[in-house]
Interface confidence: low
Amino acid sequence: NLSQDDSQPWTSDETVVAGGTVVLKCQVKDHEDSSLQWSNPAQQTLYFGEKRALRDNRIQLVTSTPHELSISISNVALADEGEYTCSIFTMPVRTAKSLVTVLGIPQKPIITGYKSSLREKDTATLNCQSSGSKPAARLTWRKGDQELHGEPTRIQEDPNGKTFTVSSSVTFQVTREDDGASIVCSVNHESLKGADRSTSQRIEVLYTPTAMIRPDPPHPREGQKLLLHCEGRGNPVPQQYLWEKEGSVPPLKMTQESALIFPFLNKSDSGTYGCTATSNMGSYKAYYTLNVNDPSPVPSSSSTYH
């Protein structure tokens, strides 16, 4: 004795990415010598058994048996979303519905609002926007490996009434370590299946210079040639250098090159040297105390840096 449910067809809801292919499968245990039929949300018959009813080359027959009717829809569009009905024309007619949800793929995000010539301690605000997602995507920000906490994602319906444009902004104070950093806006959405869809904005930060004096060789001796390199860092890189020997009033101005050269070291060269590195962002003075060692082979570390 067959129960009434044996003639009730069953199917399942399906989710498909726009442009993808969805398979609609309808099954029935007892077909009562009747054929299965699929129709679309507009109630147009797609297939009746193995007979195509709608001229749409995207729709193909996958399986047609007395117990199953499966069809595929390729290149699915957002307009294809809705309830598809599987019917079996028993007495009475029995139906099962499959909700096809079409995911809209978010476009690659666009970052706007970057202003060049950021200075250290300035506040930067960047905006990010991505259109075409369904349901609405989520945007996240990061700077290198560090997550940035932007505003909550704002959602706006696209003109097509089906997809969404999402936007977010992030505000942060820049430091010299941020010079050359990439600020990345990533879009997170189920249609991407974990794939990364992001846009980066490289930022430049202007900051005051620093400098360090490096002796070459590191342990200078009497009679040797010595180069004191004034290594300036900054953005922009320091273009002007001024070497002075301390102790004389005014300090003895020696050269405006980045390296101070002693062709043949004398004991009288001992003393404290200052290098001022200058860019249009400011100046920085580094010091180095030179103690000229005897020409013996025993290394000494009596030279000191400031």
Partner: nanobody
């Protein structure tokens, strides 16, 4: 501009009933799922009930099963929450929410649009 407006809250005695309404404007919401959440003072927002776009699929929190009924009238772009046998523990602000999707979700992260909420107080 999308707007969800809840109404129907108020003060009711234990064992009493209330019917909350959630009217949507600014877009066609009939194609989208809808959910009700609530937040009691000092507690996190919690799921109450949800309904899919057609009204054919509903889901309830354990605390709402058998007492609350969610329904919708797509012609009026409105979703309802019929609450019977109310208890003091049901006291909370009740929020209506809609996802940018046809599918109902059972957690707050699945919803993109939220109403301002309506206060329900159950007290004798």
């Amino acid at each position: 501009q999308v707007q969800l407006v809840e109404s129907g809250g108020g003060l009711v005695q234990p064992g009493g009933s209330l019917r909350l309404s959630c009217a949507a404007s600014g877009r066609t919401f009939s194609n989208y799922a809808r959910g009700w959440f609530r937040q009691a003072p000092g507690k996190e927002r919690e799921f109450v009930a949800a309904i899919d776009y057609s009204g054919g699929s509903t889901n309830y929190a354990d605390s709402a099963k058998g007492r609350f009924t969610i329904s919708r009238d797509n012609a009026k772009n409105t979703v309802y929450l019929q609450m019977n046998s109310l208890k003091p523990g049901d006291t909370a602000v009740y929020y209506c929410a809609a996802p940018a999707s046809r599918r109902p979700s059972w957690d707050a992260d699945g919803y993109d649009y939220w109403g301002q909420g309506t206060q329900v107080t159950v007290s004798s």
